[in-house]
């Protein structure tokens, strides 16, 4: 039975020294930067148990930046998980084999040299392959502050099997009250996934008014369960300008 060896390949160690200088002039300092940001766009990784996770933060800078990893904002050491992990400095990656539910969390790469520091966070969820409740990427939708008359885009990143139903809701007031007689908040349905809804994960508001300030909710459900995350919209306006409040028919958020 072939068992994995604990040793890393020498080729993967980042043992490169600073660039050789042909004269006495030092190379221009460069703060760290991402070399392939398009390969870092997938932030939410929902992975079945026992599979391998690889997070990459390809970077560069002068002098060569260092790479370290945090889990949930704290120093991440190999003995923090069964089986440890491998850092491949040459490819700016971390590899965790045979993931288990306790590996769930936020993993942050920090790339730094004496001229700057950059970081990027990935979200790992360890899932059952059988149908599960929807999972939403942390931090989305994000709070927005915009000027009166601007356009606004809220985004909700969803991972779901089976097919999810996505709703965008806004918390509203009815007769000065935010809560209905059944103790549920009043909400207005702004958008939902369906035949006429393209790109349900995005809510776009055009030419916003002050009345559209408030809390917006991305609510995602399937037959297993549901998840929701919210964000606040703040619309700023010049002084002395008043806008009438818009009243719409209320619904309850269950």
């Amino acid at each position: 039975d072939a068992l994995p060896s604990s040793e890393d390949d020498d080729d993967d160690d980042d043992s490169s020294s600073e660039e050789k200088e042909t004269d006495n002039t030092k190379p221009n300092p460069v703060a760290p930067y991402w070399t392939s940001p398009e390969k870092m766009e997938k932030k939410l990784h929902a992975v079945p148990a026992a599979k391998t996770v690889k997070f990459k933060c390809p970077s560069s800078g002068t002098p060569n930046p260092t790479l370290r990893w945090l889990k949930n904002g704290k120093e991440f050491k190999p003995d923090h998980r069964i089986g440890g992990y491998k850092v491949r400095y040459a490819t700016w990656s971390i590899i965790m084999d045979s993931v288990v539910p306790s590996d769930k969390g936020n993993y942050t790469c920090i790339v730094e040299n004496e001229y700057g520091s950059i970081n990027h966070t990935y979200q790992l969820d360890v899932v059952e392959r059988s149908p599960h409740r929807p999972i939403l990427q942390a931090g989305l939708p994000a709070n927005k502050t915009v000027a009166l008359g601007s356009n606004v885009e809220f985004m909700c990143k969803v991972y779901s099997d089976p097919q999810p139903h996505i709703q965008w809701l806004k918390h509203i007031e009815v007769n000065g009250s935010k809560i209905g007689p059944d103790n549920l908040p009043y909400v207005q349905i702004l958008k939902h996934s369906g035949i006429n809804s393209s790109d349900a994960e995005v809510l776009t508001l055009f030419n916003v008014t002050e009345a559209q300030s408030g809390e917006y909710v991305c609510k995602v459900s399937n037959y297993i369960g549901e998840a929701n995350q919210s964000a606040w919209l703040t619309v700023t306006r010049p002084a002395l300008e008043e806008r009438p409040a818009v009243m719409t028919s209320p619904l309850y958020l269950e």
Partner: antibody, heavy 116, light 109 residues
Framework: QVQLQESGPGLVKPSGTLSLTCAVS?????????WSWVRQPPGKGLEWIGE???????SYNPSLKSRVTISVDKSKNQFSLKLSSVTAADTAVYYC?????????WGQGTLVTVSS | SYVLTQPPSVSVAPGQTARITCGGN??????VHWYQQKPGQAPVLVVY???DRPSGIPERFSGSNSGNTATLTISRVEAGDEADYYC???????????FGGGTKLTVLG
């Protein structure tokens, strides 16, 4: 060390159902592994059929999904493959295997011929 | 679904270095595993997680993975290395295990 042994009929009639079982010895089927079936038609490459976790969670090759069922029997420490509506194109050596992201243990394989 | 592309055959003289490639869209973001299969035998894992070797596999076998290509390198090739070699990934997007089409390594002479 873990060992895997495939068993089942070596000849199946067209339109029938291919049924194979993989006995796991030297380890528990409830370990943090996926239990896979992989096949290899004569003179061709490896084709992943599907896999199962001890919880019963499964994943199947999309090209075979409508015909495949993989199940696990923890009490017998074994897992099974059923492939329905077989044709001559399903003639292959069938391997059971244990893996995570990669496969570290394979059975020796069993040749299944589809013929009338 | 995800596709892995391997050259059908690679030939090399004994003592030389053989390189077998495995192409896939942004494969560098995945962990690539390599298997050796000799005629009439089950496959054997020779490299996992891009470049790690299981115990018992000679140091002559090494791997790398970047961009759209993963590579299995066999240095100081021996006659006993003649076999079919397959790359494999677990495609995280489709949640499926995927094999490359295989490469037949021929050791000349």
């Amino acid at each position: 060390q873990v060992q895997l042994q495939e068993s089942g009929p070596g000849l199946v009639k067209p339109s029938g159902t291919l049924s194979l079982t993989c006995a796991v010895s030297g380890g528990s089927i409830s370990s943090n592994n996926w239990w896979s079936w992989v096949r290899q038609p004569p003179g061709k490459g490896l084709e992943w059929i599907g896999e199962i976790y001890h919880s019963g969670s499964t994943s199947y090759n999309p090209s075979l999904k409508s015909r495949v069922t993989i199940s696990v029997d923890k009490s017998k420490n074994q897992f099974s493959l059923k492939l329905s509506s077989v044709t001559a194109a399903d003639t292959a050596v069938y391997y059971c295997a244990r893996g995570t992201d990669w496969i570290d243990t394979w059975g020796q394989g069993t040749l299944v011929t589809v013929s009338s | 679904s995800y596709v892995l592309t391997q050259p059908p055959s690679v030939s090399v003289a004994p003592g030389q270095t053989a390189r077998i490639t495995c192409g896939g869209n942004n494969i560098g973001s995945e962990s690539v595993h390599w298997y050796q299969q000799k005629p009439g035998q089950a496959p054997v894992l020779v490299v996992y997680d891009d470049s790690d070797r299981p115990s018992g596999i000679p140091e002559r076998f090494s791997g790398s993975n970047s961009g759209n290509t993963a590579t299995l390198t066999i240095s100081r090739v021996e006659a006993g290395d003649e076999a079919d070699y397959y790359c494999q990934v677990w495609d995280s997007t489709s949640d499926h295990r995927v094999f490359g089409g295989g490469t037949k390594l021929t050791v000349l002479g």
